[in-house]
Interface confidence: medium
């Protein structure tokens, strides 16, 4: 069937559009064309006959068709008129006639589209704004976008005139956005440039910065004012009442009780014409005094007196805060704290309480420290100590001996010669002493505060002969491969050389043995029971020499793993048991047995007389040395068989 | 014009001694205590000793207990701070800082501060 | 000895803009913690004592609050010049110990 089709069926206006014809019929005279629905000879574009290949124009021919062979015409610069139907009249060589019709629209290319509003500047919650898209185009549909997002659902936004005016009733600060509208047609989209809405809203209530309202006096008062609004506020101050400033921002400096008062910021809006105002009460305080710290005993004296620190001045609503020694307070049960923690009492001082001790205060006002208060404890004297420690001293060298003992305040000192007072020094000096500066040497050390006395005796030897030595040590009786021992040469003499022998021989040579303190001690690391020798020291000036008595170093070890004897392990019936154990030990260990892991005695001998297969079983010995804590024990499998079953079995003791 | 002035940084081996000066002026110097605080390359702030107006309270940190020494000359308006067996973690800014009028234990006042490097 | 934690460790923010930093402390040290503000190459520079109190000539825009083991300093419409490292200290017992620092810098 013959049929028209339009390429394409929306034309724009100034485009071309082709009228195609589909299925034409073979052996054809010619065809025309014709605007409208009907072959009418008034409304003929052109004609055309094949065998001449001759194109007729008619009355609507407007010079912008061309006809092609196929039937198919095209229309150039297409205008508005152009719209509609197209018919095409076949004539074929039998004389018979064939029609078709077909149509194509023809819209505007749209212009780009604008967006008028009836309200520049609306007011938040009183004012609506109508948008309207223009120009006014038939034919077109109309869309509208907000922030580039198609409009959303509200009760508050409207459209109307075909889509082309948006209404937005009782506009709020949150409708300040970019509007856009754009109109379609089959042919063409366009978009305007965005319109921002400018709601007028405010002022809302002001806010007033910081929050804080207590203030201390000689602080900066440094208040800020804001408040939402379009355009922005105009700010005023009134403090009471009073007009103060038009600003945002109100500073005080130095501020004094007297600044205390009712501070108003009010906000204006000069477009919406509104007022609001917030109020803040400012309370300033005066500077409250710089903590310090009280003491009800200035001078206490150690392990006698407490003493109570109280942290000045009393407040209400304060917490009170201690240190000691840049530290919070240990816990002590000497140290107690009042009930509102102003008062700390330290009970029987001691030298270590000195401090610095340091109290604060804490409250919404203010924040304090003290100065540091240190403690003045008297204590001592402590018994004095005399230096050198040398006892012997040869004729003709001077003697001079020192003391001192702790003590708060420092210790007055005095020396006593076998009971006479000599003179009120810390230091003693006698030149060129002879045997008659023998005798006892008598430091008195005396604290005027506490009227407390201590003295040191120490006896002095001067003879050209020097003393027999002893030998003193610090552990009598050391543990193998644990302790350590120091022999120290006694007594300690001013120009003598210290030897040692052991066993009668020199010392050998051995990181375990080690002189020090001028030779006058000798100490032995981890000590071992060949340690336990015969240890002799000796001294010497250039006019004498003498020895120690031997000391015998007692080491205690052990005990070792010990030893079953006899070794046998088999055993006939109706033989005696003999067992006996042995262990190296220092003191002798304590034994005890165990058979097949039940007690037995506490002995070093265990006898069983007329033993039997019944007897068979694990024997152990078990080892205990009390000096040393330790412990050994060994175990023996003893097998008794019944009477001549077995060759070269022990018949017992 | 309140102002600390530190000197006597430079490069000291490790194991050696070192000697910073402070000179205080445009306060009283005898009536407020006096800090050292360093700052090591690209660290945060670290504490290192304080001196109390007469000498009687001294405090130092762990890290330099028993090596560094501070001491004061008050007619003199200067803080000292003796740092011996210097080790490469002391490479640091040394300032001097001044504890507030009022007791508290914060610095409000630091010198420019003076360079310290160890390193052999 | 009481530890301090400073967070964020870095910070970019732009002129205008409103910004706070925080800082945690180990156990209660009260109101006893300072701010200071180090420019690069400078000496640090006391800003806040006592948590809140702002020290002698520092510009309103900052404040400090807290207590207890809380605390963090607000600095609102950043000018040019507060770009650059801030450290928060306590001033309660020894050894007064720093944190980290937060490094403010321009967006």
């Known amino acids: 069937k013959l049929t028209i089709e339009s390429t394409p069926f929306n034309v724009a206006e100034g485009k071309e559009v082709l009228l195609l014809v589909h299925n034409l019929p073979q052996h054809l005279f010619g065809y025309s064309w014709y605007k409208g629905e009907r072959v009418d000879g008034n409304r003929q574009i052109i004609g055309y006959v094949i065998g001449t290949q001759q194109a007729t124009p008619g009355p609507a021919y407007s010079g912008r068709e061309i006809i092609y062979p196929n039937a198919s015409l095209l229309i150039q610069n297409i205008i508005q008129n152009d719209t509609g139907f197209y018919t095409l009249h076949v004539i074929k060589s039998d004389l018979v006639n064939e029609e078709a019709t077909g149509q194509f629209r023809v819209y505007p290319e749209l212009p780009k589209p604008s967006i008028s509003s009836n309200n520049s500047k609306p007011v938040e919650d009183k004012d609506a704004v109508a948008f309207t898209c223009e120009p006014e185009t038939q034919d077109a549909t109309y869309l509208w976008w907000v922030n580039n997002q198609s409009l959303p659902v509200s009760p508050r936004l409207q459209l109307s005139n075909g889509n082309r005016t948006l209404t937005l009733f009782n506009v709020t600060r949150n409708d300040t956005a970019s509007y856009k509208c754009e109109t379609q047609n089959p042919v063409s989209a366009r978009r305007s440039d965005s319109v921002i809405l400018n709601v007028l809203y405010g002022p809302d209530a002001p806010t007033i910065s910081p929050l804080n309202t207590s203030y201390r006096s000689g602080e900066n008062l440094n208040l800020s004012c804001h408040a939402a609004s379009n355009p922005p506020a105009q700010y005023s101050w009134f403090v009471n009442g009073t007009f103060q400033q038009s600003t945002q921002e109100l500073f005080i400096p130095n501020i004094t009780v007297n600044n205390s008062g009712s501070y108003t910021c009010q906000a204006h809006n000069s477009d919406t014409g509104l007022n609001r105002t917030t109020v803040t009460t400012i309370t300033v305080y005066a500077e409250p005094p710089k903590p310090f710290i009280t003491s009800n005993n200035s001078n206490p004296v150690e392990d006698e007196d407490a003493v109570a620190l109280t942290c000045e001045p009393e407040i209400q609503n304060t917490t009170y805060l201690w240190w000691v020694n840049n530290q919070s307070l240990p816990v002590s049960p000497r140290l107690q704290l009042s009930n509102d923690n102003r008062t700390l009492t330290l009970l029987s001082v001691t030298r270590n309480d000195v401090g610095p001790y340091e109290c604060g205060i804490q409250n919404e006002l203010s924040v304090d420290h003290s100065d540091p208060v240190i403690l003045n404890v008297l204590y001592g004297p402590d018994d004095p100590t005399i230096s050198p420690s040398y006892t012997y001293y040869r004729p003709g060298v001077n003697l001079s001996l020192s003391c001192h003992a702790a003590s708060n305040p420092p210790a007055q000192y005095s020396w006593l010669i076998d009971g006479n007072i000599q003179q009120h020094t810390q230091e003693l000096f006698i030149s060129n002493i002879t045997e008659k500066n023998s005798g006892l040497y008598t430091c008195q050390a005396n604290n005027s505060a506490s009227g407390h006395s201590r003295t040191t005796v120490k006896t002095i030897t001067v003879s050209a002969e020097l003393p027999k030595p002893s030998i003193s040590s610090n552990n009598s009786k050391p543990v193998e491969d644990k302790d350590a021992v120091a022999f120290t040469c006694e007594p300690e003499a001013q120009n003598t050389t210290y030897l040692w022998w052991v066993n009668g021989q020199s010392l050998p040579v051995s990181p375990r043995l080690q002189l020090s303190n001028g030779n006058r001690t000798l100490t032995l690391f981890n000590v071992t029971r060949n340690d336990a020798r015969a240890y002799v020291c000796g001294i010497q000036n250039s006019v004498s020499a003498n020895r120690s008595d031997p000391v015998t170093l007692d080491v205690l070890y052990g005990p070792d793993t010990p030893i079953i004897s006899p070794p046998d392990s088999s055993y006939l019936s109706g033989a005696n048991l003999n067992l006996s154990c042995h262990s190296a030990s220092n003191p002798s260990p304590q034994y005890s047995w165990r058979i097949n892991g039940i007690p037995q005695q506490h002995t070093q001998v265990l006898f069983i007389a007329k033993i039997t297969p019944n007897n068979n079983g694990t024997y152990a010995c078990f080892v205990s040395n009390l000096a040393t804590g330790r412990n050994n024990s060994i175990v023996k499998s003893i097998t008794v068989s019944a009477s001549g079953t077995s060759p070269g079995l022990s018949a017992g003791a | 014009d309140v102002q600390l002035v530190e000197s006597g940084g430079g490069l000291v081996q490790p194991g050696g001694s070192r000697e910073l000066s402070c000179a205080a002026s445009?306060?009283?110097?005898?009536?407020?205590?006096m800090h050292w605080v360093r700052q090591a390359p690209e660290r945060g702030l670290e504490w290192v000793a304080y001196?109390?107006?007469?000498?009687?309270?001294?405090y130092y940190a762990d890290t330099v207990k028993g090596r560094f020494t501070i001491s004061r000359d008050n007619p003199k308006n200067t803080l000292f701070l003796q740092m011996t067996s210097l080790r490469s973690e002391d490479t640091a800014v040394y300032y001097c800082?001044?504890?507030?009028?009022?007791?508290?234990?914060?610095?409000?006042?630091w010198g420019a501060g003076t360079t310290v490097t160890v390193s052999s | 000895d009481i530890q301090m934690t400073q967070s964020p460790a870095s910070l970019s923010a732009s002129v205008g803009e409103t910004v706070t930093i925080t800082c945690r402390t180990s156990?209660?040290?009260?109101?006893?913690l300072a701010w200071y503000q180090q420019k690069q190459g400078k000496s640090p520079h006391l800003l806040v004592y006592?948590?809140?109190t702002l020290a002698e000539g520092v510009p309103s825009r900052f404040s400090g609050s807290g207590s207890g083991t809380q605390f963090s300093l607000k600095i609102i419409s950043l000018q040019p010049e507060d770009f650059g490292t801030y450290y928060c200290?306590?001033?309660?017992?020894?050894?007064?110990?720093f944190g980290g620092g937060t490094k403010l810098e321009i967006k």
């Open positions: 800082t001044r504890r507030s009028y009022r007791s508290y234990w914060y610095f409000d006042v």
């Open positions: 445009g306060f009283t110097f005898s009536s407020f205590g």
């Open positions: 001196i109390s107006i007469g000498s009687d309270i001294i």
């Open positions: 156990e209660n040290i009260y109101s006893y």
């Open positions: 006592n948590a809140k």
């Open positions: 200290q306590h001033h309660f017992l020894s050894p007064w110990m």
